[in-house]
């Protein structure tokens, strides 16, 4: 028996369902009574789900997994994982045994989009050219860790005096805070981009300082 899985990682959004595809080619006359199917975590060997002795043995993994029972006889051994969590990320191995056995591993990459950044300024009043200001760009509830970029109003990257911190909450999602310290010119726009490297999702915010008052332009 030959087991086939997708080579590319399966990308699943947090709180959605994911299908880990696995298939085999049954011989003519194949019956489910001959099938032993095991899904397990590749690294720890923890049992996730199994089908043995002609029947679905159910989920051994937080009761969030299911097979496609009507499709098993056609060689579809895919696993459905419900309400994906950050902790589900990793490699899963599909073992299929009929007379001989084969196995293959599929990777699950979990992702969550970042919120539109909010921009804050300190100090936020009585600003004059030459003042040092701290601009903070905050974006929330994303996964995995973000890439953060700053640009000035002419599209030129700002790399000096940037400090970025990322903290995971109890669900494993990251809140990003990036701080840019700049000396004000007569006026200027400062833009922050928070990129999710898995989803290739960009979220950006900007602040424009034109003497007084400060403006936070709407996103185009």
């Amino acid at each position: 028996v030959e087991v086939q899985v997708s080579e590319d990682p399966v990308v699943a959004l947090v709180d959605t369902d994911a299908t880990l595809r696995c298939s085999f080619s049954p011989e003519p006359g194949f019956s489910l009574a001959q099938l032993n199917l095991i899904w397990q975590l590749t690294d720890t060997k923890q049992l996730v789900h199994s089908f043995t002795e002609g029947r679905d043995q159910g989920s051994a993994y937080s009761n969030r997994t299911a097979l496609f029972p009507d499709l098993l006889v056609q060689g579809n051994a895919s696993l459905r994982l419900q309400r994906v969590r950050v902790t589900d990320e990793g490699s899963y191995t599909c073992f299929v045994s009929i007379q001989d056995f084969d196995s293959a591993a599929v990777s699950l990459q979990v992702a969550a989009p970042y919120s539109k950044p909010s921009m804050t300024l300190e100090p936020n009043k009585d600003l004059r050219p030459g003042n040092m200001v701290t601009i903070t760009c905050s974006s929330y509830q994303g996964y995995p860790e973000a890439e953060v970029f700053w640009k000035d109003g002419q599209g030129v990257p700002l790399t000096g005096n940037v400090t970025t911190s990322q903290m995971a909450n109890e669900r494993g999602l990251f809140d990003v805070h990036s701080v840019l310290r700049v000396v004000l010119g007569a006026n200027g726009t400062y833009s922050c981009l928070v990129r999710n490297p898995v989803l290739q999702q960009d979220a950006h915010g900007s602040v424009t300082i034109t003497g007084q008052p400060l403006t936070f332009p709407p996103e185009a």
Epitope: Q154, L158, T189, H204, A220
Partner: antibody, heavy 121, light 106 residues
Framework: EVQLQQSGPELVRPGVSVKISCKGS????????MHWVKQSHAKSLEWIGV????????YYNLKFKGKATMTVDKSSSTAYMELARLTSEDSAIYYC??????????????WGAGTTVTVSS | DIVMTQSPVIMSASPGEKVTMTCSAS?????MHWYQQKSSTSPKLWIY???KLASGVPGRFSGTGSGKSHSLTISSMEAEDVATYYC?????????FGSGTKLEIK
Amino acid sequence: EVQLQQSGPELVRPGVSVKISCKGSGYTFTDYSMHWVKQSHAKSLEWIGVINTSSGNTYYNLKFKGKATMTVDKSSSTAYMELARLTSEDSAIYYCSKYYGSSFHWYFDVWGAGTTVTVSS
Amino acid sequence: DIVMTQSPVIMSASPGEKVTMTCSASSSVSYMHWYQQKSSTSPKLWIYDTSKLASGVPGRFSGTGSGKSHSLTISSMEAEDVATYYCFQGSGYPLTFGSGTKLEIK
């Protein structure tokens, strides 16, 4: 009409430096950054770097760090790029280009005619 | 770096023929921009923000795409379209261009 006027062709010896210029007209020079792009037969179009024409803040392609230095003279609305320690690999046409856009959404809307630099002994 | 791969490298089309060239980015880009360069001249902005035609560009040109895959199409080839077309991404530094598609006429 927005124009970028570049300095004339340069024939220089290996090991020396050359400074080429790009004068902007027809727009507010200090409102837009200036980029430099190299075009050679071997590598097509390569982005060298950018300068903020108001603050002088620069950002370079790592490949050209130490090779190119960008400066600006606001009073004459002119951007400069100096290329150091020239070798035959630096023989190319160098374009300045004006960057247009907002936030993280940019493109080159106007290009200079190009300055041909030939490095030969 | 975001690598931009253009194909084909060279193509030839008859007058009136539909022409499509593609640009594939190694990472997703928010917008793709295209430049036309005729021999011995500087590049000209041709298509910006993936699908918007620059001033003076004939309506037979169009741009489409999203993410990693983008294309430029000419609905009906004309002699004046002979040039090299470069795709360009401004989504991430360093800024990068494709290696160009040279369009010739049969």
